[in-house]
């Protein structure tokens, strides 16, 4: 049974040239986390493995950066950043949870941070 | 059912290198990660790096780091470790194994090739 | 890097003994923890995962328990084709490491 709810960093906003930080917390389940998958849409960014540590795809290795801790670092951020990005965590034994979290890139300079949200 | 067949046993010179061979068979490549493991002769294990074929990227042990090179070719569903600037304390047996990605990660290294033997001597 | 720490680093044992090997962490590590037999001339085969999980095809007289530190792995009772080489490994810190492992001979 899956018990563990996954709280991430919910709707945020950064700007153009700028970083942000994509962060997810899985909680309330003792499950081993031993892999998790950062995706856009259905391309995968970056690999975090219990045996192998953090791989980051090629494509995306100049503007991705592993961390802090299991989240992820978009930098050199284009309007093109912007969408939905996926936190998915492979776990023993319950199985997969995936957190979403939605991220606009502003040509402004009026980058406001959403609140905080949990998926269960 | 997957299967890592080696390449064959070598002797090397101090100073050299070596590049051993991993090939999978009975198996999707792209979905699983390969370990190296060495171990020397009367001695225990030792965790070289792994390389994420999808990625085509590896992680090393610091030990290692700057004299070992995995790589992998997708094509041919074959694995690649080289190790350079060899010494005496590196005639070990080397293994290379399969680790599962995603949602079975939590296996660990379930499948091993049948390990090939290094010899460095003068 | 984690040290793993096995004992005894070798035991001698009959056939039918209930034969506990340990494995301690020099910090905790939840339940990441394998364990792999060896035998002579032979590859490492996997026999338990996530410290208790016994992997397909192994048979249901070995076990494993622990978390955090302190780890067992229990033969309950010891069959000829037992007799090898044990190791435990972490893998909750990059890099994984292996203990020095645990050399069960017949008696």
């Known amino acids: 049974m899956m018990t563990g709810t996954i709280e991430t960093t919910g709707n945020i906003s950064a700007e153009k040239g700028g970083s942000i930080i994509l962060q997810c917390h899985l909680s309330s389940t003792t499950a081993q986390v031993t892999q998790v998958n950062w995706e856009q849409q259905d391309q995968l960014l970056a690999i975090c493995n219990a045996d192998l540590g953090w791989h980051i795809s090629p494509s995306f290795k100049d503007r991705v950066a592993p961390g802090p801790g299991l989240g992820l670092t978009l930098q050199s951020l284009t309007v093109n950043d912007t969408g939905e990005y996926f936190c998915i965590y492979h776990t023993y034994p319950d199985g997969t949870y995936t957190g979403r979290i939605f991220l606009e890139v502003l040509e402004s300079s009026v980058a406001e941070h959403g609140a905080r949200f949990q998926i269960p | 059912q997957v299967q890592l067949v080696q390449s064959g046993a070598e002797v090397k010179k101090p100073g050299s290198s070596v590049k051993v061979s991993c090939k999978a068979s009975g198996g999707t490549f792209s979905s699983y990660a390969i370990s190296w493991v060495r171990q020397a002769p009367g001695q225990g294990l030792e965790w070289m790096g792994g390389i994420i074929p999808i990625f085509g990227t590896a992680n090393y042990a610091q030990k290692f780091q700057g004299r070992v090179t995995i790589t992998a070719d997708e094509s041919t569903s074959t694995a690649y470790m080289e190790l350079s600037s060899l010494r005496s304390e590196d005639t070990a047996v080397y293994y290379c194994?399969?680790?599962?990605?995603?949602?079975?990660?939590?296996?660990?290294?379930?499948?091993w090739g049948q390990g090939t033997t290094v010899t460095v001597s003068s | 890097d984690i040290q793993m720490t096995q004992s005894p680093s070798s035991l001698s044992a009959s056939v039918g003994d209930r034969v506990t090997i340990t494995c301690r962490a020099s910090?905790?590590?939840?339940?990441?923890l394998n364990w792999y037999q060896q035998k002579p001339g032979k590859a490492p085969k996997l026999l338990i995962y996530a410290a208790s999980s016994l992997q397909s095809g192994v048979p249901s007289r070995f076990s494993g328990s622990g978390s955090g530190t302190d780890f067992t792995l229990t033969i309950s009772s010891l069959q000829p084709e037992d007799f090898a080489t044990y190791y435990c490994q972490q893998r909750y810190v990059f890099p994984p490491t292996f203990g020095g492992g645990t050399k069960v001979e017949i008696k």
């Open positions: 910090q905790s590590i939840s339940s990441y």
């Open positions: 194994a399969r680790l599962h990605l995603g949602s079975s990660a939590y296996y660990g290294m379930d499948v």
